[in-house]
């Protein structure tokens, strides 16, 4: 049994880091493998993560952490019974993938303005809370070409757009994702999408 693709890990910079790797053949990850992880700290102890299958030869493990600070560094040991398959380290602050925003809501009752709001996925005492910026994706269910991205570079988790920038009388969907420049993070996953029917009064044309 050998590791084909070494574990790579990303942290949500809150309580979970996710590590993925591939074995050289079909593996029952949860029965055959264990990933041991330990904070490099005098008084820390090793924790065991039981991996799950992620495709035939792929494994994924969700490492639980109390919290994360920038200085944290973890040692990782991948074991198959008594055999050490791989040894490495992981610094969560250097591999951050933020949590996805939630509670995306489209408010259509504000005159001819669409107000999209969502929730910051972090509590106020987390460092990322004040460092997230967002991308909002809006697309038409009827027309695949009607697909747009709005970059929200301010901290407030909301976006206002004129309803008239979208077509009237058809259904749209929206979703939002987050990233943090301070840690050069990857983008989060997209939030669940929300749907609404776009309708607005065409301005009266005078001839």
């Amino acid at each position: 049994m050998k590791v084909l693709q070494e574990p790579t890990c990303v942290s949500d910079y809150m309580s979970i880091s996710t590590c993925e790797w591939k074995m050289n053949g079909p593996t029952n990850c949860s029965t055959e493998l264990r990933l041991l992880y330990q904070l490099v700290f005098l008084l820390s102890e090793a924790h065991t993560c039981i991996p799950e299958n992620n495709g035939g030869a792929g494994c994924v493990c969700h490492l639980l952490m109390d919290d994360v600070v920038s200085a944290d560094n973890y040692t990782l040991d991948l074991w198959a019974g008594q055999q050490l398959l791989w040894k490495g380290s992981f610094k969560p602050s250097e591999h951050v993938k933020p949590r996805a925003p939630g509670n995306l809501t489209v408010h259509t009752n504000v005159s001819d303005t669409l107000l999209l709001t969502w929730s910051n996925p972090y509590p106020p005492d987390n460092y990322l809370y004040n460092h997230l910026t967002y991308a909002v994706n809006i697309w038409s269910e009827n027309d695949p070409a009607d697909f747009r991205i709005y970059n929200v570079t301010y901290l407030e988790p909301s976006l206002r757009i004129a309803a008239s920038t979208l077509k009237s009388g058809i259904s749209y969907r929206a979703r939002v994702r987050a990233w943090a420049q301070c840690y050069n993070t990857t983008w989060s996953e997209w939030s669940p999408s929300t749907k609404w029917h776009n309708s607005y009064r065409e301005p009266f044309e005078q001839h």
Epitope: F41, L42, L43, S44, E45, V69, S70, A71
Partner: antibody
Framework: EVQLLESGGGLVQPGGSLRLSCAAS????????MAWVRQAPGKGLEWVSA????????YYADSVKGRFTISRDNSKNTLYLQMNSLRAEDTAVYYC?????????WGQGTLVTVSS | QSVLTQPPSASGTPGQRVTISCSGS????????FNWYQQLPGTAPKLLIY???HRPSGVPDRFSGSKSGTSASLAISGLRSEDEADYYC???????????LGGGTKLTVLG
């Protein structure tokens, strides 16, 4: 609410022994390393000893090595410090502290006086 | 003699910004991060800053920490009378397998 309550302090003669206890509540005791820190009257803080969450690893300051023993009972949510061969310079308020990278919660302390 | 050196005293007037330093000796390892504790008169110490610059919840943002090599500093802005206390720095010393604390700095708020 995290609470740490020390007990067992008192007056003891040089060469004598005392056992301090620290009752913990408000958090999962078995998941946290713990430590003892002391403060002699009018002096600064001095780290004494620390123990990992399972009790597998233990550390002592040079000044108490061989005389003091730290231990814990996770089933009772209690930390202990057995102090033997006590000296006058061990006179101090002894604080029990929870460890999360630093000493993030402290008890109110118990006074140990070593005097003849 | 502590491995971490702090000034024995510091002072400031209300509203001022005060900085307290904590210096490791030249041979002191710079891998560990620094923590700061506040001890108000007659009370147990309280964690103020951990991992160089992180504040536990409930600690006002008037308190901030920073680290440079083997030294650290604690800054208190908008000084208040209730900040009068002893302040200690500390760090885990992996070469000693233990925790080292500075000698403490007594902060006096004047006026």
């Amino acid at each position: 609410e995290v609470q740490l309550l020390e007990s067992g302090g008192g007056l003891v003669q040089p060469g004598g022994s005392l056992r301090l206890s620290c009752a913990a509540s408000g958090f999962t005791f078995s998941r946290h390393a713990m430590a003892w820190v002391r403060q002699a009257p009018g002096k600064g803080l001095e780290w004494v000893s620390a123990i990992t969450s399972s009790g597998r690893s233990i550390y002592y300051a040079d000044s108490v090595k061989g005389r003091f023993t730290i231990s814990r009972d996770n089933s009772k949510n209690t930390l202990y410090l057995q102090m033997n061969s006590l000296r006058a310079e061990d006179t101090a308020v002894y604080y029990c502290a929870r460890v999360h990278r630093a000493f993030d919660y402290w008890g109110q302390g118990t006074l140990v006086t070593v005097s003849s | 003699q502590s491995v971490l050196t702090q000034p024995p005293s510091a002072s400031g007037t209300p509203g001022q910004r005060v900085t307290i330093s904590c210096s490791g000796s030249p041979l002191f390892p710079d891998s560990g991060s620094f923590n700061w504790y506040q001890q108000l008169p007659g009370t147990a110490p309280k964690l103020l800053i951990y991992a160089d610059s992180h504040r536990p919840s409930g600690v006002p943002d008037r308190f901030s920490g920073s680290k440079s090599g083997t030294s650290a500093s604690l800054a208190i802005s908008g000084l208040r009378s209730e900040d009068e206390a002893d302040y200690y720095c500390g760090t885990w010393d992996y070469s000693l397998s233990g925790y080292v604390l500075g000698g403490g700095t007594k902060l006096t708020v004047l006026g």
